[in-house]
Amino acid sequence: AVNGTSQFTCFYNSRANISCVWSQDGALQDTSCQVHAWPDRRRWNQTCELLPVSQASWACNLILGAPDSQKLTTVDIVTLRVLCREGVRWRVMAIQDFKPFENLRLMAPISLQVVHVETHRCNISWEISQASHYFERHLEFEARTLSPGHTWEEAPLLTLKQKQEWICLETLTPDTQYEFQVRVKPLQGEFTTWSPWSQPLAFRTKPAALGKDT
């Protein structure tokens, strides 16, 4: 069995992907390992090959079907196993029962676009990607805006406590370059976490009109 220095963590994107990371101190980098998924009430099973992402951690994506297909539900339990090759046979390294809708991490929002920009304001919209229809409107978002001379880590977080796929940024500086990011999280799930941040959207506010107080 794997000792306390090992970790096996997986998340479900709510549609057809389970992403897993397995880490073990002292494991050989060239060891061939895989993750095997067996749902308790489905006819299919799936395997992915763990590929190194750092000195002692490996990752892989279990592709369960077409990206927008609903492959698992709230009642499913998936048994996940880490198997590593030892000579001619596979050795089980870890076994985890995984409730997909308790371990959600959605894909990053996509299709960010500027709907309207002014001197001090900018209206931005986006779309969620590969998100289950089960959520209905039970999603929340966080957004952040990168101002000149600052880092993303310094950017204050704006929280949208509902499924609102747009935002109106206020009190911006005229004729200034900004970047904007957003992430999404379902409200349900014991270990549900934020999606990755979206790709940044760059935009520039309009210059102030000369001789006018805007």
């Epitope: 306390g4 970790q7 096996f8 963590t9 985890q96 029962d97 409730k99 308790e102 371990n103 270990f191």
Partner: nanobody, 127 residues
Amino acid sequence: QVQLVESGGGLVQAGGSLRLSCAASGGTFSSYAMGWFRQAPGKEREFVAATTRGGGRTMYAVSTEGRFTCSRDNAKNTVYLLMNSLKPEDTAVYYCAAMTSYYSGTYYPDSSDFDIWGQGTQVTVSS
């Protein structure tokens, strides 16, 4: 803090099944991660399974080979261990345990991680 009482042990033939129950009282059950351990005569206490506070993740000892299923019902303050395809080597006293600290369900916990223990229930598998 909770008190734990196991039940469901007994004598079973190889290949048979048993379902152990662990009833908790005197505390907020949903604030504890729960685990099952076993101890065979003359051997050290061995990890069997552990489940998180909400049951979203459950880790199993590799030795269970997928034959055991651990589940919890927070409404009933009970954690279960369903044991199928039992083997003589599964013979042991089975203990239920509760962990007050946070457990992510992503690693194998040690017996020292658990603070509260039941008195155990004997499981004997005959060949």
